[in-house]
């Protein structure tokens, strides 16, 4: 799991787009709201993001949906979908 | 599973270039992007530059305008053309390989290649 530390000045991404794959894991952490990375999972897939990064993804995902993902963001989960277990898959409501 | 062997590096003055190739062998369908990495003496593993499966290229700040990232899609190689050369770029280079599919999905990597810059 990746340390809480505070967002360097300036680091704060405005929207998910291919500058973060530079960001380090606790820098994605720190710097990448939650709900915008919700609102723009349709850009994820077309970012090549490395495996320890879309670790770090999901588990801001997790953290905001602790209940199971909603279906807006399940529909674009793309190669985040190799994140999930058979534990996250049950807590989903798709219908 | 997946294979990538680098080769290229080398001692190499200040201000020269060098060009490092990136070979991928065994599960190659379904590479969605390569790149490099460099470790430099007491640093950690950073990005230098990645291209993707349809040829979209990226770069580190510090690189930009030297460095230029290429993938040859028939013979599963990526390249990395270094120009002007500085000693900071003295580090391992590393290639990497996303796989994005099953079986094996992940991230792989070379063994690396030694860059060095000096005079």
């Known amino acids: 799991e990746v340390e809480k530390t505070a967002c360097p000045s300036g680091k704060k991404a405005p929207e998910i787009d291919e500058s973060l794959i530079f960001y380090k894991k606790w820098e994605l952490e720190a710097c990448v709201d939650a709900a915008l990375l919700a609102t723009q999972m349709d850009r994820v897939n077309a970012i090549p993001f490395t495996y320890e990064q879309l670790d770090v993804l999901k588990h801001k995902l997790d953290e905001l949906y602790p209940q199971g993902y909603p279906e807006s963001v399940i529909q674009h989960l793309g190669y985040l979908f190799l994140k999930m277990s058979p534990e996250d898959i049950r807590k989903w409501n798709v219908t | 599973q997946l294979q990538l062997v680098e080769s290229g590096g080398g001692l190499v003055q200040p201000g020269g270039s060098l060009r490092l190739s990136c070979a991928a062998s065994g599960s190659v369908n379904s590479i969605t992007a390569m790149g490099w990495y460099r470790q430099g003496p007491g640093n950690e593993r950073e990005l230098v530059a990645v291209i993707t499966d349809r040829g979209r290229a990226s770069y580190a700040d510090s690189v930009k305008g030297r460095f230029a990232i290429s993938m040859d899609n028939d013979k599963h190689t990526v390249y990395l053309q270094m120009d002007s050369l500085k000693p900071e770029d003295t580090a391992v280079y590393y290639c990497?390989?996303?796989?994005?599919?099953?079986?094996?999905?992940?991230?792989?990597w070379g063994q690396g290649t030694q860059v060095t810059v000096s005079s």
């Open positions: 990497n390989a996303h796989r994005r599919t099953w079986p094996h999905p992940g991230d792989y």
